[in-house]
Interface confidence: medium
């Protein structure tokens, strides 16, 4: 789970070891702060749960691509 130390910096200390189907994801943000021990991606699910993931993993990259495309495609 994401952790806030001296908010507003949020860091990830552990990554999920399970994939999450892209349709369950609502958004993501990258964690690149030097105050954090590792770079990370935090996904927010459609039920507003936040999950830390490893940006080096293919499923994480696929998911970010998917969400990027979703935001670029206006809903009609």
């Amino acid at each position: 789970q994401p952790d806030a130390i001296n908010a507003p910096v949020t860091c990830c200390y552990n990554f999920t070891n399970r994939k999450i189907s892209v349709q369950r994801l609502a958004s993501y943000r990258r964690i690149t702060s030097s105050k954090c021990p590792k770079e990370a991606v935090i996904f927010k699910t459609i039920v507003a749960k936040e999950i830390c993931a490893d940006p080096k993993q293919k499923w994480v990259q696929d998911s970010m691509d998917h969400l990027d495309k979703q935001t670029q495609t206006p809903k009609t």
Partner: antibody, heavy 122, light 107 residues
Framework: QVQLVESGGGLVQPGGSLRLSCAAS????????MSWVRQAPGKGLEWVSS??????????SYAASVKGRFTISRDNSKNTLYLQMNSLRAEDTAVYYC?????????????WGQGTLVTVSS | DIELTQPPSVSVAPGQTARISCSGD??????VYWYQQKPGQAPVLVIY???NRPSGIPERFSGSNSGNTATLTISGTQAEDEADYYC??????????FGGGTKLTVL
């Protein structure tokens, strides 16, 4: 343990119809996507169709070769997957396997049924 | 769809290492899965997510994937490993693409 049992195969004339069933047990059916994969005699594996899980509102997808002719569906109350095959052609002759998957779009098949043979011939 | 190419056949002596390749455009950016199929039987998943073995699959099976090529490696090949092997990847919306299959013969 996970079990997938196909049925409904048989001999059908070109232009005819057939409905395949796949009875699932040993897992929470609605939480998994399900697919049909076929294998023509002496040939390789060919993905036919998928129906996703509850997280994706059971979205469906089809191979170009069957789109408009085949319809995939599922009955979660019966733990059963279906494939309605219409306007059958000789090239649809194959063993049809049902298989389950968990994640999308990283679709891979961790359990398979033993298959049911569909023969399209006059 | 992603097009996957496998050699039709590979031969190996018992106890030796068998390598089966699967090539496709930028395949290294996708996960690759491998299945073993013996005559008259359904396929069995032997490798998932490039290099992971499902429980019950012997340690002699391993996988790798980078660039345009994924490889299934069987170390210390045994007679029971004689089978057809298929690689598989995915595109969008739960569609799957299979390679043409490779017949592994244990001499």
């Amino acid at each position: 343990q996970v079990q997938l049992v196909e049925s409904g195969g048989g001999l059908v004339q070109p232009g005819g119809s057939l409905r395949l069933s796949c009875a699932a047990s040993g897992f929470t059916f609605r939480s998994y996507g399900m697919s049909w994969v076929r294998q023509a005699p002496g040939k390789g594996l060919e993905w036919v169709s998928s129906i996703e899980h509850k997280w994706t509102n059971y979205a469906t997808s089809y191979a170009a070769s069957v789109k408009g002719r085949f319809t995939i569906s599922r009955d979660n109350s019966k733990n059963t997957l279906y494939l309605q095959m219409n306007s059958l052609r000789a090239e649809d002759t194959a063993v049809y396997y049902c298989a389950r998957f968990e994640f999308t779009p990283w679709t891979y098949f961790d359990f398979w049924g033993q298959g049911t043979l569909v023969t399209v011939s006059s | 769809d992603i097009e996957l190419t496998q050699p039709p056949s590979v031969s190996v002596a018992p106890g030796q290492t068998a390598r089966i390749s699967c090539s496709g455009d930028n395949l290294g950016k996708k996960y690759v899965y491998w299945y073993q199929q013996k005559p008259g039987q359904a396929p069995v998943l032997v490798i998932y997510d490039d290099d992971n073995r499902p429980s019950g699959i012997p340690e002699r099976f391993s996988g790798s994937n980078s660039g345009n090529t994924a490889t299934l490696t069987i170390s210390g090949t045994q007679a029971e490993d004689e089978a057809d092997y298929y690689c598989q990847s995915y595109t969008a919306q739960s569609s799957a693409s299979f390679g043409g299959g490779t017949k592994l013969t244990v001499l």
